[in-house]
């Protein structure tokens, strides 16, 4: 297993609709034909997998149908979008990239992106 550098932004603020997007960039040593991208969430020293997708050359990045993630890939960059976020989902989101093919296998883990989610204030009732 060989190490690989992965870069991602330090901080991202989710939109009022609970959507956060960030770019995950990896330093590929060659042209990879199969890349696996996993988003991990670290909170209170617990790490959980948020979503994962394998990108095969000639195809787009496809997450499972029920995934809260979507993404596109361009060269050595993956543009990730996480939806349906609420204030309780605030945490460090780590991008893990694995170059599955061709051999050798490379693994890179980013430092994480702190995503802040603020639940929108409910609209006050208005009298007309």
């Amino acid at each position: 297993c060989k190490a690989m550098h992965v870069a991602q932004p330090a901080v991202v603020l989710a939109s009022s609709r609970g959507i956060a997007s960030f770019v995950c960039e990896y330093a590929s040593p060659g042209k990879a034909t199969e890349v696996r991208v996993t988003v991990l969430r670290q909170a209170d020293s617990q790490v959980t997998e948020v979503c994962a997708a394998t990108y095969m050359m000639g195809n787009e990045l496809t997450f499972l149908d029920d995934s809260i993630c979507t993404g596109t890939s361009s060269g050595n960059q993956v543009n990730l979008t996480i939806q349906g976020l609420r204030a309780m989902d605030t945490g460090l989101y780590i991008c893990k990239v694995e170059l599955m093919y061709p051999p050798p296998y490379y693994l890179g883990i980013g430092n994480g992106t702190q995503i802040y989610v603020i639940d929108p204030e409910p609209c006050p009732d208005s009298d007309f």
Partner: antibody, heavy 118, light 110 residues
């Protein structure tokens, strides 16, 4: 000299499971990806799946997804293919093969015949 | 399961040349230069003969050559010999699965 030596023939009943082993020698075990390919009697080659020894990550043919698993024992330099809920149509010679890079299989085991019959 | 189409059989006399075709689509053979060819004698494991469309592994006779045009790859055996009688399979990367094999071609030396 790179070598892959597979376990002997197996006869199983429908619904049972079978495990085929593939002992590797002559190369650094974790460096080479391993594939499994099967061939039904008188039929062509069918790709079963691939394992990356250094990570344990596997990818399988959609046809067999859910019934197949691939594992490895690094200390024994051995790969294993397990196929569960066997059906008569799983009767085939199962081969392990090393990945030469660029989607080719450069060294092959001698094959293991698995017969599924009631 | 996608499959690459090969002729069921080809034959030739000793010393002649024979060519086996392997037809796919732009999602496999036509889209990438990851075409391989394997030789399989009865009761034996397959042996890699050609990779990356036209490259030969060390130890494989230069009588075996590979090429590709559009969605079709070809394996040519020149100076046909008795020991070339075997089944031949092509394989290719495909964007839906890492590996797909051809239907296989039986080569008979007359």
């Amino acid at each position: 000299q790179m070598q892959l030596v597979q376990s002997g023939a197996e006869v199983k009943k429908p619904g049972a499971s079978v495990t085929v082993s593939c002992k590797a020698s002559g190369y650094t075990f974790t460096n080479s990806y391993i594939h499994w390919v099967r061939q039904a009697p008188g039929q062509g080659l069918e790709w079963v799946g691939r394992l990356i020894p250094s990570s344990g990550y596997t990818i399988f043919s959609q046809k067999l997804q859910g019934r197949v698993s691939m594992t490895r024992d690094t200390s024994m330099s051995t790969h294993y293919l397990t196929l569960s809920h066997l059906r008569p149509e799983d009767t085939a010679v199962y081969y392990c093969a090393t990945d030469g890079g660029n989607y080719n299989l450069d060294f092959w085991g001698q094959g293991t015949l698995v017969t599924v019959s009631s | 399961q996608p499959v690459l189409t090969q002729p069921p059989s080809v034959s030739g006399s000793p010393g002649q040349s024979v060519t086996i075709s392997c037809t796919g689509t732009s999602s496999d053979v036509g889209g990438y230069n990851y075409v391989s060819w394997y030789q399989q004698h009865p009761g034996k494991a397959p042996k890699l003969m050609i990779y990356d469309v036209s490259s030969r592994p060390s130890g494989v006779s230069n009588r075996f050559s590979g090429s590709k045009s559009d969605n079709t790859a070809s394996l040519t055996i020149s100076g046909l010999q008795a020991e070339d009688e075997a089944d031949y399979y092509c394989s290719s990367y495909t964007s839906s699965s890492p590996y797909v094999f051809g239907t296989g071609t039986k080569v008979t030396v007359l």
